[in-house]
């Protein structure tokens, strides 16, 4: 019961996190105009990963996409890549975790397969969350660097009567959404990994016993039949029908993938 709850909660938390990562990636407010020097501006600038926008006090908002790929800063490209990788991994993780949920039965899927799928999705969520956190942090670092550079420039070159106010940018809402969403995805992933440990059945590694019959030799061995899912061994004892007799050493049981518990 606790395992199902942990797995379910991990799935829900990751789902919210990935939705947040998608939202943050699409949001225009990654950086917003710093209003410290001009709190009563009639023109408000903000920028996202894909376009920059200007909102006038009348409410008119104009957004322009970054129609160049080569002309964009490498850091921005890196942030885009990290966010997209995070979304893709998260989406795959969600797909895998749906089939891994203990409360959902799909055919005759065994617990070990579900455990493997839970672990896989958990790892994917962790990496997805880390990608989002890394992407947002790289962008935040870029903003901080540019902020102090523009602050230094703001107080130079004002020899004449005319002042040129340089627009400085500070953290936008998308950064906070991204950090929180990345954190949630990470937590969800950890919860899935914890749930995986509970899903993996306890098993004792016995030496297989060979029964020498007059016809074929029938061996009973734990974990000998590979599940067709491709997610690991089927830990229930299934009969292996071999054509000829085997020695005890040849028909031995191998430690399961989940013996680290």
């Amino acid at each position: 019961m606790a395992v199902t709850a942990c797995q379910g909660l991990g799935f829900v938390v990751s789902l919210i996190g990935i939705a947040g990562i998608i939202a943050a990636t699409c949001m225009d407010q990654w950086s917003t105009q710093d209003l410290y020097n001009n709190p009563v501006t009639a023109v408000f600038n903000y920028q996202g990963l894909w376009r920059s926008c200007v909102r006038e006090s009348s409410g008119f908002t104009e957004c322009r996409g970054y129609f160049t790929l080569l002309g964009l800063p490498a850091m921005l490209q890196a942030v885009r890549a990290l966010m997209i990788v995070g979304i893709v991994l998260g989406a795959i993780g969600l797909l895998v975790s749906i089939f891994a949920l203990k409360c959902i039965r799909i055919g005759s899927m065994e617990d070990s397969a579900k455990a493997n799928m839970t672990l896989t999705s958990g790892i994917m969520f962790i990496v997805s969350g880390l990608c989002a956190i890394a992407g947002v942090s790289v962008f935040a670092n870029m903003l901080v660097t540019n902020f102090w550079m523009s602050t230094a420039n703001m107080y130079t070159g004002m020899g004449g009567m005319v002042q040129t106010v340089q627009t400085r940018y500070t953290f936008g809402a998308a950064l906070f959404v991204g950090w929180v969403a990345g954190g949630l995805t990470l937590i969800g992933g950890v919860m899935m990994c914890i749930a995986c440990r509970g899903l993996a059945p306890e098993e004792t590694n016995y030496k297989a016993v060979s029964y020498h019959a007059s016809g074929h030799s029938v061996a009973y061995k734990p974990g000998g039949f590979k599940a067709s899912t491709g997610f690991g061994s089927n830990t229930k004892n299934k009969k292996i029908y071999d054509g000829g007799a085997r020695t005890e050493d040849e028909v031995q049981s191998y430690p399961s993938k989940h013996d680290y518990v």
């Epitope: 105009q33 001009n38 009563v40 501006t41 009639a42 023109v43 600038n45 903000y46 920028q47 920059s52 926008c53 200007v54 006038e56 006090s57 009348s58 409410g59 008119f60 104009e62 322009r64 005319v162 002042q163 040129t164 106010v165 340089q166 627009t167």
Partner: antibody, heavy 119, light 113 residues
Framework: DVQLVESGGGLVQPGGSRKLSCAAS????????MHWVRQAPEKGLEWVAY????????YFTDTVKGRFTISRDNPKNTLFLQMTSLGSEDTAVYYC????????????WGQGTSVTVSS | DIVMTQSPSSLTVTAGEKVTLTCRSS????????????LTWYQQIPGQPPKLLIY???TRESGVPDRFTGSGSGTYFTLTISSVQAEDLAVYYC?????????FGSGTKLEKK
């Protein structure tokens, strides 16, 4: 056709108060920001205040801050300017103007209402 | 506050003449986000309220004759009337539309020679 009609002007004693109104018609009043601009006799234009379509934020010129308040009644399509502690420097023709959707400009203006502050 | 300075304060013209009015601002009115200059030009005929001519420094308001042209960027702007007509005799104001408080220039009066 867009129409803005100001009212409430007249002679006011120094230190007195006055409330100006601006009745709007011919457009969806609740979706536009509105300005008050004044013009002293034989002088240039002076922007006074601005209120956004949603009543907030509100901006004032420094000379009237704390003395004037701008408000609007969207269901009644009316803009107001409440003026207190009036002085001779507030004598002017007061215009209400609609904020254009583009460029933070003022695209439609009323004919103005005259306020004279004198004893 | 942004200070707007217009010159000349008055100008005597004849019909058909080309005139250029200038406006300077104490701060740049160029917004880096959209590369637009937040400067507006108004025309006020005596006894009438002002009329919007040009916004974003160079965009003509609908219904404004194409003899009116706005140009300039940053802190220096001009309004050019390619061929002055009798109905153009008025006071022309430039306005900072970049930050509050919005400020107007002192105006340039166009008079008949």
């Amino acid at each position: 056709d867009v129409q803005l009609v100001e009212s409430g002007g007249g002679l006011v004693q120094p230190g007195g108060s006055r409330k100006l109104s601006c009745a709007a018609s011919g457009f969806t009043f609740s979706t536009f920001g509105m300005h008050w601009v004044r013009q002293a006799p034989e002088k240039g234009l002076e922007w006074v205040a601005y209120i956004t379509s949603g009543n907030s934020p509100i901006y004032f010129t420094d000379t009237v801050k704390g003395r004037f308040t701008i408000s609007r009644d969207n269901p009644k399509n009316t803009l107001f300017l409440q003026m207190t502690s009036l002085g001779s420097e507030d004598t002017a023709v007061y215009y209400c103007a609609r904020s254009s959707y583009y460029g933070n400009s003022m695209d439609y203006w009323g004919q103005g209402t005259s306020v004279t502050v004198s004893s | 506050d942004i200070v707007m300075t217009q010159s000349p304060s008055s100008l005597t013209v004849t019909a058909g003449e080309k005139v250029t009015l200038t406006c300077r601002s104490s701060q740049s009115l160029l917004n880096s986000g959209n590369r637009k200059n937040y400067l507006t030009w108004y025309q006020q005929i005596p006894g009438q309220p002002p009329k919007l001519l040009i916004y974003w420094a160079s965009t003509r308001e609908s219904g404004v004759p194409d003899r009116f042209t706005g140009s300039g960027s940053g802190t220096y702007f001009t309004l050019t009337i390619s061929s002055v007509q009798a109905e153009d005799l008025a006071v022309y104001y430039c306005q900072n539309a970049y930050s509050y408080p919005f400020t107007f220039g002192s105006g340039t009066k166009l008079e008949k020679k």
